[in-house]
């Protein structure tokens, strides 16, 4: 019994005065607590606690389940204990088969003994299987057997507490160890889509998938820059051991424009945190935005090809697309396709392929597109560059020589005189009159130019050249002069097209 200095409060004294007491099953347990300030007896075994306010604890017929620690406490909070073993050959172990352990921590197999004098108190695998080689344990007859530093590999390990009694091995009921893994990495989070575009009133639903080693991972949906609690629903699965998956689905049944923003799925465990975001854009109505990929004014040479290309954003999906020229719709020569195969793609491409364009095929080419909410269009003005063509070359009654040429861009007409039989016409002649005429064709057709010179200026035999040219090429027409005496013979025009 403890001895203390006079005047100081002392712990209670217990009779019998020993730390451990062994009684046989069926015998009486009689424990007396002596203290002027007695408060209570407490009995503890396997997380059980029973109290008794009598200073004498009497159990007339002891059972194995009366094995445990009996503690007497006084009003000063000082206490004294005795451990009682109730020896029962038929019940060597008291057990609580709950067995949960955290990875890297110790866990207690609760199988305290009713008889401290048995030997070889240890753990054994079920059905004669050996325990893992690295499993270390410490037996304590009053508490059970402590497994040191639980490993993940011990999960679902089946084991018994074991003792030797009179040369025979006796096993407890079986225990199944459930190991709660330690977090050794942050959770893995992913989101069903990185961005959402909706019209007002449509449902917004997004799912975050959280993967970790156990269900004790924490997760939540948050709205950035907001503390509002969001409504979410969960589904979860254990895909075998240490492979847990949770799906957290956030839903806004009728989205509004002011619901637009960034939503974050956040997850954390004791190792760290991870997050992933998704962006919601809610528009009051659908839209179409068209972006030309080439200049909307196009110049192309006669006989060449050109591709008119647009990209456009359309939400909701485009329903009708067409290319139009001179009030006629193209049925072929064009293609329309999404810019990407991504599920949230709203960008599309449309291409009109114009091949071997003729001078008469210039004009306005229009792309039209519509969805359930809006229509949109874009026009391309196509100009076909053509080499000048001399339409007429005549001597007029007033003695003028006139040359009319058409082409695009607008041709320039120069005049030259070639004396005698010379092939080269070098001396230039200034025109008397130059006019650009209105074409009777479409507005994007060839431009017509008329130029005139006075033939009376020519006093010698020779040839007059009318040369029409632009950026694309040139064409010439010729007038032949022949003098007989003082008379000018009939002028014979002819043309030479110069490539």
């Amino acid at each position: 019994q403890p001895s203390v200095s006079p005047g100081e409060p002392s712990p209670p004294s217990i009779h019998p005065g020993k730390s451990d007491l062994i009684v046989r099953v069926g015998d009486e347990i009689r424990l007396l607590c002596t203290d002027p300030g007695f408060v209570k007896w407490t009995f503890e075994i396997l997380d059980e606690t029973n109290e008794n306010k009598q200073n004498e604890w009497i159990t007339e017929k002891a059972e194995a389940t009366n094995t445990g620690k009996y503690t007497c406490t006084n009003k000063h909070g000082l206490s004294n204990s005795i451990y009682v073993f109730v020896r029962d050959p038929a019940k060597l172990f008291l057990v609580d088969r709950s067995l949960y352990g955290k990875e890297d921590n110790d866990t207690l197999v609760r199988c305290p003994l009713t008889d401290p004098e048995v030997t070889n108190y240890s753990l054994k695998g079920c059905q004669g299987k050996p325990l893992p080689k690295d499993l270390r344990f410490i037996p304590d007859p009053k508490a059970g057997i402590m497994i040191k530093s639980v490993k993940r590999a011990y999960h679902r390990l089946c084991l018994h507490c074991s003792v030797d009694q009179e040369g025979k091995s006796v096993l407890s009921e079986k225990f199944i160890l459930k190991v709660r893994p330690a977090f050794k990495a942050v959770p893995v989070v992913s989101v069903s889509k990185a961005s959402y575009l909706l019209r007002e009133g449509e449902e917004f639903t997004v799912t975050c998938t959280i993967k970790d080693v156990s269900s004790s991972v924490y997760s939540t949906w948050k709205r950035e820059n907001s503390q509002t609690k969001l409504q979410e629903k969960y589904n979860s699965w254990h895909h075998g051991d240490f492979n847990y998956e949770r799906q957290a689905t956030l839903t806004i049944s009728s989205a509004r424009v002011n619901d637009s923003g960034v939503f974050m799925c956040y997850a954390n465990n004791t190792f760290g945190s991870a997050n992933v975001t998704t962006t919601l854009e809610v528009v009051d109505k659908g839209f179409i935005n068209i972006f030309p990929m080439i200049n909307t004014t196009v110049f192309v040479n006669d006989g060449e090809n050109v591709d008119l290309i647009v990209e456009y954003e359309a939400f909701p999906k485009p329903e009708h697309q067409q290319w139009i020229y001179m009030n006629r719709t193209f049925t072929d020569k064009w293609e329309d396709y999404p810019k990407s195969e991504n599920e949230s793609n709203i960008r599309y491409v449309s291409e009109l392929h114009l091949t071997r364009l003729k001078g008469t095929e210039g004009g306005t080419y229009t792309f039209l597109v519509s969805n359930s909410d809006v229509n949109a269009a874009i026009a391309f003005n196509v100009y076909v560059n053509t080499k000048p063509e001399i339409l007429t070359y005549d001597r007029l009654v007033n003695g003028m020589l006139q040359c009319v040429a058409a082409g695009f861009p607008e041709p320039t007409i120069d005049w030259y005189f070639c004396p005698g039989t010379e092939q080269r016409c070098s001396a230039s002649v200034l025109p008397v009159d130059v006019q650009t005429l209105n074409s009777s064709g479409p507005p994007f057709g060839k431009l017509v130019v008329q130029s005139s010179i006075d033939s009376s200026a020519f006093k010698h035999n020779g040839t007059v050249e009318c040369k029409a040219y632009n950026d694309v090429g040139k064409t010439s027409a010729y007038f032949n002069f022949a003098f007989k005496g003082n008379n000018k013979e009939q002028i014979h025009p002819h043309t030479l097209f110069t490539p």
């Epitope: 609580d96 949960y100 459930k178 190991v179 709660r180 004790s216």
Partner: nanobody
Framework: EVQLLESGGGLVQPGGSLRLSCAAS????????MSWVRQAPGKGLEWVSA????????YYADSVKGRFTISRDNSKNTLYLQMNSLRAEDTAVYSC????????????????RGQGTLVTVSS
């Protein structure tokens, strides 16, 4: 064959009471601490309460403390849960299960768990 059979569930108004029972057979009932767990629609499994092998110690989740009482009768191999002052958020399937993990996480589950009884709290 191990069996855990829950009963006593039903529809109750907010503020009302129910007593759930769990009859155990096929294993040594007094060798296990026992737990009640619940699963609300669309939610994960939630631990509610536990009791030690002989009923001397009881444990409760914060959400039910002061309203629910767990008890056991080892002579009848039966576990009980007295539920008072019920709320709409208590609506769930309640199951009894063998074992008690002080962390409340029950990783790897339970050795045995019943199919459950539905408790609906609604006006």
């Amino acid at each position: 064959e191990v069996q855990l059979l829950e009963s006593g569930g039903g529809l109750v108004q907010p503020g009302g009471s129910l007593r759930l029972s769990c009859a155990a057979s096929g294993f040594t009932f007094d060798s296990y601490a026992m737990s009640w767990v619940r699963q609300a629609p669309g939610k994960g499994l939630e631990w509610v309460s536990a009791i030690s092998v002989r009923g001397g110690s009881t444990y409760y989740a914060d959400s039910v403390k002061g309203r629910f009482t767990i008890s056991r009768d080892n002579s009848k191999n039966t576990l009980y849960l007295q539920m008072n002052s019920l709320r709409a958020e208590d609506t769930a399937v309640y199951s009894c299960a063998t074992g008690y993990d002080p962390s409340g996480h029950y990783y790897g589950g339970f050795d045995y768990r019943g199919q459950g009884t539905l408790v609906t709290v609604s006006s």
